[in-house]
């Protein structure tokens, strides 16, 4: 906490500019008007303040806005955002996607910090759902964002937002998350034709039930083994040898390399040896 001291004569800051970098902490506290700072926040980022000086500026804003900063200030926080605690951020009401982008830009290239997580949480809760534009923005900055959400949080994602999801955004999702996302994806892509539909739905198939896999096997989709290995074991087990052969197409020979891995291992054990032999891969049930 900086002690309250009078501003020396001639030092009162008429505006936020580079001359302030030469001010001591107590001078910043005494000579910079908090309201002026709030209206000229966009200038702060262009000035090479020390971390200690930034602490003083934050303190001034905290005093001016004890209930939380207005969005007009938040949007221009820049590097001052890194000084905010999750507790500070919980007081904010961020509704503009531009504000969100501006703050995510400050943290770009770093892991998702507790501050960023709190910011995103506040933003999404304020919007009521994870709409397509928000999801687009969040996955652009954090490809693993979607998979960091709980199944309960994912249930608030509307099917229309699924169009924003890229395959890499689902890389770290577990089966419980895909169970929630798959029906949404199925709904979102339902009007696409066979081959286009498969390209879009492929990344979500870890949540697909047996009947949908059986349906896909009738559509010449040629599923690769990487996708097949992500399928739910309980969804794969009821498939016949003929259905798996149709589902994988030319990739069926890849079953050999994965014969000891789930779900292939468990599926093989469910099949009659005569049926497996028709594949000519040397699979032993």
């Amino acid at each position: 906490e900086v002690e309250k001291t009078a501003c020396p004569s001639g030092k009162k800051a008429p505006e936020i500019d580079e001359s302030l970098i030469f001010y001591k902490k107590w001078e910043l506290e005494a000579c910079v008007d908090a309201a002026l700072l709030a209206t000229q926040m966009d200038r702060v980022n262009a000035i090479p303040f020390t971390y200690e000086q930034l602490d003083v500026l934050k303190h001034k804003l905290d005093e001016l806005y004890p209930q939380g900063y207005p969005e007009s200030v938040i949007q221009h926080l820049g590097y001052l955002f890194l000084k905010m605690s999750p507790e500070d951020i919980r007081k904010w009401n961020v509704t503009s996607l531009e504000t969100l982008k501006a703050l995510l830009e400050v943290n770009k290239g770093h892991e998702m910090s507790p501050q960023v997580a709190t910011l995103i949480d506040r933003f999404v809760k304020g919007r009521g759902q994870l709409d397509k534009d928000t999801l687009d923005t969040l996955t652009a900055f954090y490809p693993g964002y979607l998979c960091s959400l709980s199944p309960e949080e994912l249930s608030s994602v509307p099917p229309s937002s699924i169009w924003a999801v890229r395959p890499q955004d689902l890389d770290t999702c577990d089966p419980r998350q895909l169970d929630v996302l798959y029906p949404k994806a199925r709904l979102a892509f339902q009007n696409m034709n066979g081959s286009e539909y498969f390209v879009k739905i492929q990344s979500f198939l870890g949540g697909a039930p047996t009947e949908d896999l059986k349906a896909l096997s009738q559509q010449n989709v040629s599923m690769d083994l990487a996708t097949f290995m992500k399928l739910r074991t309980d969804a794969v087990l009821p498939l016949t040898v003929a259905e798996v052969q149709k589902l994988l197409g030319p990739h069926v020979e890849g079953l050999k390399a994965e014969e000891r891995h789930r779900p292939v291992r468990d599926w093989i054990l469910r099949q009659r040896q005569d049926d497996l032999d028709t594949l000519g891969l040397g699979l032993q049930g």
């Epitope: 395959p167 890499q168 890389d171 690769d224 083994l225 990487a226 097949f228 290995m229 992500k230 990739h251 020979e253 890849g254 079953l255 050999k256 390399a257 994965e258 000891r260 891995h261 789930r262 891969l281 040397g282």
Partner: antibody, heavy 119, light 108 residues
């Protein structure tokens, strides 16, 4: 560019353990299994086992059961192999190698980590 | 487990000479499930030939692979200095996956 970066040489005492990281970059980590191979002067190349990064499902060469433990951290695209109860027999170069799911050949190999077990 | 025996263990060849390395399996291997790696001293192995006869990316066309059942081979139609290395065959037809002992090929 696809790379599998392994850590530098390790000198460890008999009975100790060592954990070797293999940091993958330049490809989708979950589309490939990660296999581990031992290369020693006496025995040539030996397959230790593999892990599927999607399911953490592992398969081991029986010879290395209880000796090696394979794990992955999807968030950092890193595979690990821990070797325990080390003896002079475990002195070797250990490689991680990626294997496209559905194939059995290793199309990219790691830089190799030399483990020397000596008191 | 399937034992892969490579012969010769060590050999050298003159520039332009045709070279054949062999890999013999203790029991039958499906040809899709056999491949070859090349390793230069101080370097990691690299995939050279997969599925018995398919050249990996960047492998010169003077290399070829053939075989079936228990007998496989790698052939260099015309030896060049950069081909000096160790070559290992590898099968994934049966668990555990196994490798041959290698052939160390030198330049005369």
């Amino acid at each position: 560019e696809v790379q599998l970066q392994q850590s530098g040489p390790e000198l460890v005492k008999p009975g100790a353990s060592v954990k070797i990281p293999c940091k993958a970059s330049g490809y989708t980590f979950t589309d490939y299994n990660m296999d581990w191979v031992k290369q020693s002067h006496g025995k040539g190349l030996e397959w230790i086992g593999d892990i599927n990064p999607n399911t953490d499902d592992t398969i081991y060469n029986q010879k290395f059961n209880g000796k090696a433990t394979l794990t992955v951290d999807k968030s950092s695209s890193t595979a690990y192999m821990e070797l325990r109860s080390l003896t002079s027999e475990d002195t070797a170069v250990y490689y991680c190698s990626r294997r496209l799911i559905g194939t059995g050949y290793f199309d990219v190999w790691g830089t190799g980590t030399t483990v020397t077990v000596s008191s | 487990q399937i034992v892969l025996t490579q012969s010769p263990a060590i050999m050298s060849a003159s520039p332009g000479e045709k070279v054949t390395l062999t890999c013999s399996a203790s029991s039958s291997v499906i040809s899709t499930y056999l491949c070859w790696y090349r390793q230069k001293p101080g370097s990691s192995p690299e995939l050279w030939i997969y599925s018995t006869s398919n050249l990996a990316s960047g492998v010169p066309a003077r290399f070829s692979g053939s075989g079936s059942g228990t007998s496989y081979s790698l052939t260099i139609s015309s030896m060049e200095a950069e081909d000096a290395a160790s070559y290992f065959c590898h099968q994934w037809s049966n668990y555990p996956y196994t490798f041959g002992g290698g052939t160390k090929l030198g330049m005369k």
